[in-house]
Interface confidence: low
């Protein structure tokens, strides 16, 4: 049986090195062998030798860009030869290179990197198409560049100042189907600047008899600061509305501050400062006492989306695009130092994960209009990052006990063991030697009427509270109706 | 040609430290990897831990870490390895060795081309 | 960080073939190198990127390596073949090098 025709001829140049060149099939079932033919030097000269398997490398001297080569492969048995069809290969189209060496990476002014690198091989001035990817240390999403024509220095402009970054570099000819593979990585900083803008937010405390109030300052370094960013300290400088008089409090190292205020309105203003100069200013207006704030949230809701607690508000304006969210245990004595809060920006909705918060944990989160420096009304509500079953049942008593009927009432469980939010209470009942029996009543009913009881017949009842983690029983009481 | 001239041997007691240098010529010392492999008397190869001499970085065996340090001099392309708080059984021959430039086509990494002849160091109280 | 195993010694007569293997855990996924120290020299790289060859290795010298074995195949073997030969992979997690323990290979 004559061999197979060969096909599927493919071929790549591995760039100084060889011409590499595969076809099908790739087993032979009977004794094959094949004779390789390569045309080369635009069709002057010719290069054949015979190869067992169905691959061959041709060797360096044959394979010089820039050239039209051709190959053809011929199978041969002891029952005749078969010679494929002829193909042609531009070698710098299917040329691959090794990847490259990046010699140096260094920041230079304005957020860039300046890359400096070089190919394994002498690459005789083909022009060279480069991409750059880079990520920040602690992100897992590559952004790449591509450098058109590229030199062998490249310039990564875009950056985030004083910020890790990890970069690789591949390339491959302006004319060539195939990249090299990604370079080494190397890890460089970007130079570092002046510090970010901060979040700035405040609590206030009732104000006394003489208007006056203790307002605590808060701030810490904005979402989309530099990880690595350092400060040396913060200035504050507030005034009042009404007044030219500007106080300056400076060099203080805490990321909060306690001011004493009188009752009218305030601008409060705070700048954080390194060894290259200091930030904008984070500004904040704080309202007279007596002063109505606006309300701009419609409704709000909070729900579990594992891994999260995801809290969602609709807004009556569409300006509005900062909110402060603020949350803290309900159990919390007072609002500092429990209270933790974050800036959202551009959007109606906030998400934290479940692991930050404590478990059965009833948290009451605030969510504060912020319209340029002055804050609005804030809408709250309750939630907990994760329930749990009630630490306790619900204590019980039966009352109105008639020939058929009873009254069975429940004291709420206090907050501090629930665990959650009680969605429903269920009573269960039971005559001496009968079926259990229950019946279901929504979290506000404290008591339930049972009918329909035999007379003169002992029962055991007790009831379940049930939070979205499941039920707690409390204890079982025992009643006989009349005869 | 490219060759790694290392430091000559070294006896040392136990809990001090030893440096060990390397000098490299005949290529751009800054464009690849410089590994340190130690080998035991009469046991096998052991890897150390490399260092990139363009940028300083590092990468150490888990082994090593704390213990070991490799820094490098661009300006006389030499590096080096210092390892501390020595113990009996550090005792070796460190070799330093680059890492190649030998096309590798469907690697990503690659082997070590060039070796210096080692350095032995004795811990002996 | 991947174990490489390789057997302790490999004897063969001159002019015969030697194969020395070093088994990991799925080492066809992992690039492997060998190398060849004489005794009292530094070791020398004679395979690389699996079955490669750097410029002034004899052809006798050939690697292979899928599944969970890699080998290093010397034909034709000559008494200056006799070596320790150490097989080793990069941990693309870490970029850690690490060797097998060597094999010794004895030309009878």
């Known amino acids: 049986v004559l061999p197979t025709k060969p096909e599927n001829i493919s071929c790549v140049f591995y760039f100084d090195r060889n011409l590499t060149c595969t076809w099908r099939p790739e087993k032979e079932t009977n004794d094959t062998s094949y004779i390789v033919t390569l045309t080369y030097s635009y069709g002057k000269s010719n290069y054949s030798d015979n190869a067992t398997e169905a691959s061959y490398s041709f060797p360096r001297s044959c394979a010089m860009p820039p050239d039209i080569c051709s190959v053809e492969v011929q199978a041969q048995n002891g029952d005749g030869k078969v010679k494929s069809d002829i193909t042609y290969w531009h070698l710098i189209s299917i040329a691959k290179t090794e990847p490259p060496i990046i010699l140096s990476v260094n920041p230079i002014c304005n957020r860039m990197f300046q890359i400096q690198w070089k190919p394994r091989e002498k690459t005789r001035g083909f022009p060279l198409v480069c991409m750059l990817r880079f990520r920040t240390v602690n992100s897992s999403h590559w952004t790449e560049v591509n450098f058109e024509n590229c030199k062998q220095v490249c310039n990564l402009t875009g950056l985030q100042a004083f910020t890790e970054y990890v970069l690789a570099l591949r390339f491959r000819f302006n004319d060539s189907r195939y990249w090299s593979k990604w370079s080494k990585e190397e890890t460089r900083v970007t130079m570092e600047e002046v510090p970010h803008v901060l979040d700035l937010w405040r609590i206030l405390e009732p104000a006394d008899m003489n208007g006056d109030r203790k307002v605590r300052l808060l701030w810490k370094k904005a979402r989309g600061a530099p990880v690595l960013e350092k400060t040396f300290g913060y200035h504050i400088q507030y005034f009042a509305e009404n007044s030219t008089n500007l106080t300056e409090i400076n060099n203080i190292t805490t990321q909060q501050y306690e001011l004493l205020l009188m009752s009218q309105a305030h601008s409060v203003s705070v700048t954080s400062f390194n060894s290259l100069g200091k930030s904008q200013e984070a500004i904040l207006r704080i309202p007279d006492v007596h002063e109505k704030t606006f309300q701009y949230i419609k409704s709000m809701k909070a729900y579990i989306a594992e891994p999260l607690l995801v809290v969602n508000w609709q807004s009556s304006i569409p300006a509005v695009d900062t909110w402060i969210v603020e949350w803290l245990p309900e159990a919390a004595m007072s609002k500092f130092p429990a209270l933790s809060w974050e800036s959202v920006s551009q959007v109606t909705n906030w998400t934290i994960e479940q692991d930050k918060l404590k478990p059965f944990t009833c948290y009451n989160i605030s969510v504060y209009p912020v319209l340029g420096h002055r804050v609005g009304e804030p809408y709250s509500i309750q939630a907990y990052a994760k329930e749990g079953t009630p630490l306790k049942g619900p204590e019980t008593r039966v009352e109105n006990i008639g020939l058929r009927t009873a009254t069975i009432t429940w004291k709420e469980i206090p907050k501090s063991a629930r665990n959650g939010f009680i969605n429903n209470y269920t009573v269960f009942y039971q005559a001496e030697g009968g079926k259990e029996l229950s019946k279901t009543v929504n979290s506000h009913a404290l008591q339930c009427d049972l009918e329909s009881l035999t007379r003169r017949t002992s029962y055991t009842v007790w009831v379940m509270a049930s939070t979205r983690a499941g039920g707690t029983n409390g204890v079982r009481i025992n009643f006989k109706t009349l005869s | 040609q490219v060759q790694l001239v290392q430091s000559g041997a070294e006896v040392k007691k136990p809990g001090a430290s030893v440096k060990v240098s390397c000098k490299a010529s005949?290529?751009?010392?800054?464009?690849?990897?410089m590994h340190w492999v130690r080998q035991a008397p009469g046991q096998g190869l052991e890897w150390m831990g490399w260092?990139?001499?363009?940028?300083?970085?590092?990468n150490y065996a888990q082994k090593f870490q704390g213990r070991v340090t490799m820094t490098r001099d661009t300006s006389i392309s030499t590096a080096y390895m210092e390892l501390s708080r020595l113990r009996s059984d550090d005792t070796a021959v460190y070799y330093c060795?680059?890492?190649?430039?030998?096309?590798?086509?469907?690697?990503?990494?690659?082997?070590?081309?060039?070796w210096g002849r080692g350095t032995l160091v004795t811990v002996s109280s | 960080l991947p174990v490489l195993t390789q057997p302790p010694s490999v004897s063969v007569a001159p002019g015969q073939t030697a194969r020395i293997t070093c088994g990991g855990n799925?080492?066809?996924?992992?690039?492997v190198y060998w190398y060849q120290q004489e005794p009292g020299q530094a070791p020398v790289l004679v395979v690389y990127?699996?079955?490669d060859r750097p410029a002034g290795i004899p052809e006798r010298f050939s690697g292979a390596n899928s599944g969970n074995t890699a080998t290093l195949t010397i034909s034709r073997v000559e008494a200056g073949d006799e070596a320790d030969y150490y097989c080793?992979?990069?941990?693309?997690?870490?970029?850690?090098?690490?060797f097998g323990g060597g094999t010794k290979l004895t030309v009878l």
């Open positions: 080793q992979v990069w941990d693309s997690s870490t970029d850690h090098g690490v």
């Open positions: 005949g290529y751009t010392f800054t464009g690849y990897y």
């Open positions: 799925n080492i066809g996924s992992k690039t």
């Open positions: 060795a680059r890492e190649d430039v030998v096309p590798a086509a469907m690697s990503f990494y690659y082997g070590m081309d060039v």
């Open positions: 990127d699996d079955t």
């Open positions: 260092i990139n001499p363009n940028s300083g970085g590092t």
